[in-house]
């Protein structure tokens, strides 16, 4: 909005910063147990996994960066039940990976989470 | 803990995933006005900036990934006061950038935020 008052290079840097903050899928660390809603006596090793989740800014304060498309990534994790009654089991855990994002006015009806197969 | 039961490759993949989820500085999008605690009639363009903030997992549930060292990055932003009495002003805004992180048991006494010069 102030192109006539500031040099082009400064405006370019500011604009590039803005582009980088825009709503998009970003690599995020998610805690498996809390996403999965598992009981307190079930643990995963590693407890966290890296996936892409929607994040960043929108052009309007009233809009929220939400996922519009999702894929599910299978992560191999050790599932440990306490007390240990058996050897920790290697299980495939399907984790939601956001592949598309959009600035939307309301929270979605069905938030995407983790699916155990 | 289960090296004897599973092939080395699977364990290597799991370990690499775990390393990548560990508590460390991660690029994050922060909303300037809310961090700065500015009044509702002051806006920034862009409203968000990219900085590094501590994030990720800790080995114990009781620990939180916290910043241990911080640098301040100067970001050039337009500050807009409404009603507009003058041209939007290009101001340097100092934003906390976490350079070191550690899994700690309690919240810090002094959370780092944004400093206006």
């Amino acid at each position: 909005f102030a192109a006539t008052f500031y040099d082009i290079e400064t405006l370019k840097v500011i604009d590039e910063e803005w582009q980088r903050t825009q709503c998009s899928p970003r690599e995020t660390c998610v805690e498996v147990a809390s996403e999965l809603g598992k009981s307190t006596n079930t643990f995963f090793k590693p407890p966290c996994v890296n996936v892409f989740r929607c994040g960043g800014c929108c052009n309007e304060e009233s809009l929220i960066c939400m996922n519009t498309s999702t894929s599910y990534i299978s992560k191999q994790l050790f599932e440990i039940s306490v007390p240990l009654t058996s050897v920790p089991e290697l299980v495939p855990v399907k984790v939601a990976n956001h592949t598309g994002c959009k600035c939307l006015p309301t929270a979605p009806r069905h938030p995407y989470s983790i699916i155990r197969r | 803990f289960a090296a004897t039961f599973y092939d080395i490759e699977t364990l290597k993949v799991i370990d690499e995933e775990w390393q990548r989820t560990q508590c460390s500085p991660r690029e994050t999008c922060v909303e300037v006005a809310s961090e700065l605690g500015k009044s509702t009639n002051t806006f920034f363009k862009p409203p968000c900036v990219n900085v590094f903030r501590c994030g990720g997992c800790c080995n114990e549930e009781s620990l939180i990934c916290m910043n241990t060292s911080t640098s301040y990055i100067s970001k050039q932003l337009f500050e807009i006061s409404v009603p507009l009495t003058s041209v939007p002003e290009l101001v340097p805004v100092k934003v906390a950038n976490h350079t070191g992180c550690k899994c700690l048991p309690t919240a810090p006494r002094h959370p780092y935020s944004i400093i206006r010069r």
Partner: antibody
């Protein structure tokens, strides 16, 4: 200063399409959503939808879904609104309006009168 | 859709006297982020609308101090402390908390 310059008045036959343009200047085009609002003669304002020029994402008023398409050309900082299958009750002044981060439509084009008549 | 109801639809006022326009929404306009996206627009004859007030009570650039906005939840008011000749036109409330964005039907301000 911020300016939104709209294309000229149009007269269309029922069933035809119209494409209205809105050229923006004086600000970073991709940093603000562009709204389209219409006003029938002597009537109030009706919101048609908006486009995010950064990525082309659109949100339309259900009333116009399937008939309206909003696009942008970031190289020329121009927003477009196309309305198809025109009816006589689509006769209105069509406005583009920039929307600020806090939600108010802070700058408006002067409007484009679209007349639908056989 | 959120219905915005303005009263009165027509308001004849004497120059220099105060004027008040009410706007009621069919649902609360408080967003999940705590903000209320209720705005007021002025449309002078033959002109495009112009933003007066944003987010209930914030005056926009170049808007005279005689204009003020107030309210919360579903009930909002636009006040003009002393009406001037240039204030003649139609005033609209609008909300951007919910989609679709909606407007009130307008209140015509005229001089007695």
């Amino acid at each position: 200063q911020v300016q939104l310059v709209q294309s000229g008045a149009e007269v269309k036959q029922p069933g035809a399409s119209v494409k209205v343009s809105c050229k923006a200047s004086g600000y970073t085009f991709t940093g603000y959503n562009m709204y389209w609002v219409r006003q029938a003669p002597g009537q109030g304002l009706e919101w048609m939808g908006y486009i995010d020029p950064y990525n082309g994402d659109t949100t339309y008023n259900q009333k116009f879904k399937g008939r309206v398409t909003m696009t942008t050309d970031t190289s020329t900082s121009t927003a477009y609104m196309e309305l198809r299958s025109l009816r006589s009750d689509d006769t209105a002044v069509y406005y583009c309006a920039r929307t600020s981060y806090y939600g108010g439509m802070d700058y408006w084009g002067r409007g484009t009168l679209v007349t639908v008549a056989s | 859709d959120i219905v915005m109801t303005q009263t009165p639809l027509s308001s004849p006022v004497t120059l220099g006297q105060p004027a008040s326009i009410s706007c009621r929404s069919s649902q609360s306009l408080v967003h999940s982020n705590g903000n209320t996206y209720l705005h007021w627009l002025q449309q002078r004859p033959g002109q495009p609308p112009r933003l007066l007030i944003y987010k209930v009570s914030n005056r926009f650039s170049g808007v005279p101090g005689r204009f003020s906005g107030s309210g919360a939840g579903t009930d909002f008011t636009l006040k003009i402390s002393r009406v001037e000749a240039e204030d003649v036109g139609v005033y609209y409330c609008s909300q951007s908390t919910h989609v679709p964005r909606t407007f009130g039907q307008g209140t015509k301000l005229e001089i007695k």
